[in-house]
């Protein structure tokens, strides 16, 4: 399986909220002995490779922000901890999962990574990640709403 990032760049005004998204692309093994662990973290372009460094998002580690479930289930973090930091990660039945960040500040700018671990019991873990950039802007040059740039091209879309 692979992880797709529909958008590689999100440009948002300060104070806005943004939802960063990743999509799990098949084939996905939905057997009894396969489980998925999904999470989010901040990173850099990489000492070893992009997303190999794991930094907290608003002081919450990848452990705090994880989603867990088998291949068929939807999941959501409704932890008070995440909510208190203006964060919420969620996953649907169709392989899409996201993290929503409210009340953006300039400090939220940076590289974000989604990580999917396919746990094949008796075999190994298979890790796949996706990376995307968030730029939070302030002042007269900032957009009125988040503008997203698709990964495949530089055409932008405005999210209202």
């Amino acid at each position: 399986f692979k992880v797709a990032t529909p958008y590689s760049l999100y440009v948002c005004p300060e104070g806005q909220q943004v939802t960063l998204t990743c999509r799990l692309l098949g084939p996905v093994d939905k057997g009894h002995d396969v489980t998925f662990y999904k999470t989010w973290y901040r990173s850099s372009r990489g000492e070893v490779q992009t997303c190999s460094e794991r930094r907290p998002i608003r002081q919450l580690t990848f452990q705090d922000l994880h989603l867990h479930h088998g291949g068929h289930q939807a999941a959501q973090t409704s932890h008070d901890l995440a909510q208190r930091h203006g964060l919420e990660s969620a996953s649907d039945h169709h392989g899409q999962f996201s993290i929503t960040m409210r009340n953006l500040t300039l400090l939220d700018s940076g590289l974000y990574c989604c990580l999917v671990v396919e746990i094949r019991h008796h075999h190994s873990e298979h890790r796949v990640h996706g990376a995307m950039e968030l730029q939070v802007q302030t002042g007269k040059d900032a957009p009125s709403n988040c503008v997203v740039y698709p990964s495949s091209s530089q055409d932008s879309e405005q999210i209202t």
Partner: antibody, heavy 117, light 107 residues
Framework: QVQLQESGPGLVKPSETLSLTCTVS????????WSWIRQPPGKGLEWIGY???????NYNPSLKSRVTISVDTSKSQFSLKLSSVTAADTAVYYC???????????WGQGTMVIVSS | EIVLTQSPATLSLSPGERATLSCRAS??????LAWYQQKPGQAPRLLIY???NRATGIPARFSGSGSGTDFTLTISSLEPEDFAVYYC?????????FGGGTKVEIK
């Protein structure tokens, strides 16, 4: 703050079954691997196996024929059974939480088990 | 099974000195390697995961590097509480295995 506590007999006779329980407090037993690791006196660490919160297990091939790990989510406990023990199974037994794609981040304090008649 | 070989077996240093510990894998483990510290009578404590990510609450004097088969744990300036045994552990596949350990002792 998640804490782990091992419990069980400290002395087991050869050929009998070693049984230990690990109680998880201060957090959920969901979404992690729950492992057993042992350390013979003066030696290094050996991973015995894990149970995932979903009930799936994975054992070290060197011990697989003798090991059973089970979980009771209602009690936030997981257990180790090691059959047909010999003196070579004398060790400190640790339970630990293992995070997917990470490492053993929380350990119990360990319990010494001596195999002797 | 992946075999991890740690060297040296014992490292004799003084407080304030730099400690460099090595871990070599029998085959590539990518960067899926962790380091632990163990003091006498205590459980191991996670220091580093994925070769260079410090675990929560670990001081900046501990750093990890490497990928593939060769890894290093560096303690930039030894504090009295750092004298202990250090283990590396791989998680690229099961069974999970540990190195034999390096004892860092006071010179």
């Amino acid at each position: 703050q998640v804490q782990l506590q091992e419990s069980g007999p400290g002395l087991v006779k050869p050929s009998e079954t070693l049984s230990l329980t690990c109680t998880v407090s201060g957090g959920s037993i969901s979404s992690y691997y729950w492992s057993w690791i042992r350390q013979p006196p003066g030696k290094g660490l050996e991973w015995i196996g894990y149970i995932y919160y979903s009930g799936s297990t994975n054992y070290n091939p060197s011990l697989k024929s003798r090991v059973t790990i089970s979980v009771d989510t209602s009690k936030s406990q997981f257990s180790l059974k090691l059959s047909s023990v010999t003196a070579a199974d004398t060790a400190v037994y640790y339970c630990a939480r293992d995070i997917p794609a990470s490492a053993f981040d929380i350990w119990g304090q360990g319990t010494m088990v001596i195999v002797s008649s | 099974e992946i075999v991890l070989t740690q060297s040296p077996a014992t490292l004799s240093l003084s407080p304030g000195e730099r400690a460099t510990l090595s871990c070599r894998a029998s085959q590539s483990v990518s960067y899926y390697l962790a380091w632990y510290q163990q003091k006498p009578g205590q459980a191991p404590r996670l220091l580093i995961y994925d070769a260079f990510n410090r675990a929560t609450g670990i001081p900046a004097r501990f750093s990890g590097s490497g990928s593939g088969t060769d890894f290093t744990l560096t303690i930039s300036s030894l504090e009295p509480e750092d004298f202990a045994v250090y283990y590396c552990q791989q998680r690229i596949n099961w069974p999970l295995t540990f190195g034999g350990g390096t004892k860092v002792e006071i010179k």
